[in-house]
């Protein structure tokens, strides 16, 4: 191709190749991308005495591993292996929070309820939270202009495999009842291309779960619909149930009073409807 | 492995102390949390503070601040400087730490505050 | 900070016997609670941590359950040795804002006969 020929012309090094970074669609790698997960490691294994046995630095280089050097729409989850076995972690059964379109109050509820996990409660999923980041082909650089976007570019980019496998891993290992948070607000609730939709439904495991619960979170104070009999959240209670795992359902009409009540359940206002 | 605070005594009401805990048969150098609570005579047991040694942040009661500053002065030894003495701080100090729980417990210094 | 509720305050119970001892927290701790046992004279040692996960060398005749709010410390067989003061312990943390705090229950005096 031209671009060959220019290269050949130009006796260009593969690893001088930043100065002609592929343009892709999506924002670049977060700035300051090494220190911010390096950092978030050592906090979180502060804060959680049962994760000190992991070497942040070790983590780092796994998570490093996985896409520098690579093309980064070639990406697979076999490339994050190695991080996602430093990031072991298990989850009590019962205690597995599932969210699709609804992640702030997924997260809300866990900060109160501490005994329940969502998947940015464990050492991986908080390490690359709201995180974005790319390297390139055949040099040790991260790309901060630009990174691929899932939709215009490629599904094969670090971040969405990233999600991918740690998202896999976090339904594969959950137990007993698991709980998803669904926004009711949205014209899919049950979004089949949500990551919920397409990887961790169908990769809980029903020798060991037991039943899905879904909390369908209302958006409006006056909504007193019954947002379980939408025919999205009827498409969900058909593939769980195939799947040979019980589906129950749960309007959660006013989602501050029921955060509220997760922080003072004895307080009498909980003993009505949330 | 072990710990062993040192520094308790005899002091008037508002005077300053500085206990001091040492580690023996294992360092501070990766990350564990070394902390020092008290038990006042025939009362429970009372949380002061800790300290990350692997980061050196530093957590107190909400009582504890103000009065009371925990440090790490070397890969071994954790201190906890006391000012302001009242007789209510008259107990029995002791470190705890470990790199999960509080696991490890040094046997204690009496700390009296009388005049 | 959290407040621990510990009861009862004292318990007496038989040789071979069962003790239950209940420990609350003011907020969702999770799993983190230890249970300790104190002699008079000596220093508290640990039994329990992380709400049901027996310490080295800790008899199996000591059970932690629990979580959230809600824990229990259970001694069965009792044996006179069992004679101590035992407390609950609780660790919390928050992310964001960089705190982390412990707290003790009040203690309970169990009493062998």
């Known amino acids: 191709s031209g671009l060959n020929d220019i290269f050949e012309a130009q006796k260009i090094e593969w690893h001088e190749l930043p100065r002609w970074r592929q343009q892709w669609s999506g924002s670049g790698t977060t700035s300051r991308f090494p220190e911010t997960v390096l950092a978030r490691c050592v906090k979180y294994t502060e804060v959680h005495p049962e994760m000190r046995h992991v070497d942040c630095q070790s983590v780092w280089d796994a998570f490093k591993g996985a896409f520098i050097s690579k093309y980064p729409c070639n990406i697979t989850e076999e490339d994050y292996q190695p991080l996602v076995k430093l990031g072991t972690q298990t989850v009590p059964c019962n205690k597995t929070l599932l969210w699709s379109r609804i992640k702030d109050l997924a997260h809300q509820f866990t900060q109160v309820q501490r005994d329940m996990f969502t998947l940015e409660d464990m050492l991986l999923g908080y390490l690359a939270d709201d995180l974005t980041w790319c390297g390139e082909f055949n040099t040790f650089e991260i790309n901060y202009q630009s990174c691929p976007d899932w939709r215009k570019d490629c599904s094969n980019n670090p971040v969405s495999v990233f999600w991918k496998t740690v998202s896999r891993r976090f339904a594969e290992t959950a137990c007993g009842v698991v709980h998803v948070m669904l926004n009711g607000s949205r014209s899919k609730i049950f979004d089949k291309n949500s990551t919920f939709g397409s990887v961790e439904v169908h990769n809980l495991q029903p020798e060991k779960v037991q039943a899905l619960e879904a909390w369908v979170i209302h958006g409006g104070r006056e909504d007193s619909r019954d947002l379980c009999q939408d025919p999205t959240i009827k498409e969900l209670e058909s593939i769980i149930s195939k799947r040979n795992i019980r589906f129950f359902c749960k309007n959660i009409y006013r989602p501050d009073k029921f955060l509220q009540c997760v922080k003072n359940p004895e307080d009498s206002s909980c003993l009505s409807g949330i | 492995q072990s710990l062993e605070e040192s520094g308790g005594g005899l002091v008037k009401p508002g005077a300053s102390l500085t206990l001091t805990c040492k580690a023996s048969?294992?360092?501070?150098?990766?990350?564990?949390?070394m902390c020092w609570v008290r038990q006042a005579p025939g009362k429970g047991l009372e949380w002061i503070s800790c300290?990350?040694?692997?980061?050196?942040?530093t957590y107190y009661a909400n009582w504890a601040k103000g009065r009371f500053t925990i440090s790490r002065t070397s890969s071994t030894t954790v201190t906890l400087q006391m000012t302001s003495l009242t007789a209510a701080d008259t107990a029995t100090y002791f470190c705890?730490?470990?790199?999960?729980?509080?696991?490890?417990w040094g046997p204690g210094t009496l700390v009296t505050v009388s005049s | 900070d959290i407040v621990m509720t510990q009861t009862p305050s004292s318990v007496e119970a038989a040789v071979g016997g069962t003790v239950t001892i209940k420990c609350q927290a003011s907020?969702?701790?999770?799993?983190?609670l230890a249970w300790y046992q104190q002699k008079p004279g000596q220093p508290p040692k640990v039994l329990i941590y992380r709400a049901s996960t027996l310490a080295s060398g800790v008899p199996s005749r000591f059970k932690g359950s629990g979580s959230g709010t809600h824990f229990t410390l259970t001694i069965s067989d009792l044996e006179s040795a069992d004679a101590a003061t035992y407390y609950c312990q609780s660790y919390y943390y928050t992310t964001d804002d960089n705190y982390r705090s412990w707290a003790f229950g009040g203690g309970t005096e169990v009493v062998v006969k």
């Open positions: 048969g294992f360092s501070f150098s990766s990350g564990c949390d």
């Open positions: 300290i990350y040694t692997g980061s050196g942040s």
């Open positions: 705890a730490g470990d790199s999960d729980y509080l696991g490890l």
């Open positions: 907020q969702n701790i999770g799993n983190y």
